[in-house]
């Protein structure tokens, strides 16, 4: 298995994690995308996902997580607002492409949230809540059940690599199952 790379983010409670997952290829633009947490010894757990098909520049909010898919630049923007210490962990973006396995986007995100207020403009709880007021109608995305751990063996694409997804991938089971996305408290 290829060793996966991680990008570390160290933030304070109340701040916002703002990352971009780079999916590059046009064939993925309309695919449903998800933000997952990976806990030791467990399967990746989907926390939020875009609609299916994914809509361009249309924010989807699930609790404190906001996803925005920018088709024209091949970027999925993920924001986790009002961070809590317990949000610390390893996260990843994936692209759902049933019946194939989800396609993992690199790098994984190692989030470390510590106690204490940084005082950075726009990072306190009040301003975070003001900036990210999104209509509740955007919180109803449903995500497929993620069942395969095999994405962890994929090598990260290099600049000049052909990163089109291989055709010989194992099919997902329970592809018709959907679960309601868990909402952060």
């Amino acid at each position: 298995a290829t060793k996966l790379t991680e990008e570390k983010y160290e933030l304070k409670e109340g701040q916002t994690l703002d990352v971009k997952c780079d999916y590059t290829l046009e064939k993925f633009a309309s695919s449903q995308k998800a933000w997952q947490i990976i806990r030791d010894g467990e399967m990746p757990k989907t926390l939020a996902c875009t609609e299916r098909p994914s809509k361009n520049s249309h924010p989807v909010q699930v609790g404190r997580i906001i996803l925005e898919d920018y088709h024209d630049h091949g970027l999925l923007r993920v924001r986790m607002v009002n961070l809590q210490v317990e949000d610390s962990g390893l996260y990843q973006c994936v692209i759902y492409q049933p019946p194939k396995e989800p396609h993992m986007l690199f790098d994984r995100i190692r989030l470390v949230v510590t106690k204490g207020f940084s005082g950075t403009p726009g990072s306190n709880e009040n301003s975070t809540q003001n900036v990210y007021k999104i209509p509740p109608t955007t919180t109803k995305a449903l995500c497929p059940l993620y069942t395969s751990p095999r994405t962890v063996t994929q090598a990260p694409p290099k600049s000049t690599a052909d990163v089109s997804t291989p055709d010989s991938e194992i099919n997902l089971t329970n592809v018709t199952d959907i679960i309601r996305v868990p909402v952060f408290n």
């Epitope: 703002d18 780079d22 590059t24 064939k27 024209d72 630049h73 091949g74 052909d162």
Partner: antibody, heavy 121, light 111 residues
Framework: EVQLVESGGGLVQPGGSLKLSCAAS????????MHWVRQASGKGLEWVGR??????????YYAASVKGRFTISRDDSKNTAYLQMNSLKTEDTAVYYC????????????WGQGTLVTVSS | DIVLTQSPDSLAVSLGERATINCRAS??????????LHWYQQKPGQPPKLLIY???NLESGVPDRFSGSGSGTDFTLTISSLQAEDVAVYYC?????????FGQGTKLEIK
């Protein structure tokens, strides 16, 4: 190995037409947008236009200097991109390069060797 | 259209010395914190060769004496120690907006 080979260049009179081809190999052609870039002798690079993939309905975009005169197309079954040039002007004289990007709005990692188009009476 | 202006137009640097080329955009070429600005090297009779992509990422196989920096509207290509084979014309290019555009080029020579 990725290869891009342009063909179809030559001498044409002002007002005439010419169709350039770009034969691609070594990658999944249908996955990537294809671009044309030109360079007049002793001058800089000028982006001509691009054609996106089937996922984006083969949308095309052009530089203002060629819009309405040039048309980019592609045949995914033949792994080939085309540049149809009509109403040619002397200022269209240049080496025309076919290039492949690395994905949506990404860099040009691969270039052909170019084909020379000369517009002259 | 986004206009890219390179400076200087030409540059003569001694072997082993640092060479710096600037590229200024008429408007930001960033989307979020990604800069869609790339650098190419072109030698006579050859197609351009990608050096740096998205402002600061070194293309595979390119010597690490090349580096890129900047964001928004101001970008820099630096060659830390000029080698004879670096004599070429260098171009910046933006892909943040259609139409894509190139800078006018900077000719690098040995002093």
């Amino acid at each position: 190995e990725v290869q891009l080979v342009e063909s179809g260049g030559g001498l044409v009179q002002p007002g005439g037409s010419l169709k350039l081809s770009c034969a691609a190999s070594g990658f999944t052609f249908s996955t990537y947008a294809m671009h044309w870039v030109r360079q007049a002798s002793g001058k800089g690079l000028e982006w001509v236009g691009r054609i996106r993939t089937k996922s984006s309905n083969y949308a095309t975009y052009y530089a203002a200097s060629v819009k309405g005169r040039f048309t980019i197309s592609r045949d995914d079954s033949k792994n080939t991109a085309y540049l149809q040039m009509n109403s040619l002007k002397t200022e269209d004289t240049a080496v025309y390069y076919c290039t492949r990007d690395m994905g949506i709005r990404r860099q040009f990692a691969y270039w052909g060797q170019g084909t020379l188009v000369t517009v002259s009476s | 259209d986004i206009v890219l202006t390179q400076s200087p137009d030409s540059l003569a640097v001694s072997l082993g010395e640092r060479a710096t080329i600037n590229c200024r955009a008429s408007e930001s070429v960033d989307t979020f914190d990604y800069s869609f600005l790339h650098w190419y090297q072109q030698k006579p009779g050859q197609p351009p060769k990608l050096l740096i992509y998205r402002a600061s990422n070194l293309e595979s196989g390119v010597p690490d004496r090349f580096s890129g920096s900047g964001s928004g509207t101001d970008f820099t290509l630096t060659i830390s120690s000029l080698q004879a084979e670096d004599v070429a014309v260098y171009y910046c290019q933006q892909s943040n907006e259609d139409p894509y555009t190139f800078g006018q080029g900077t000719k690098l020579e040995i002093k």
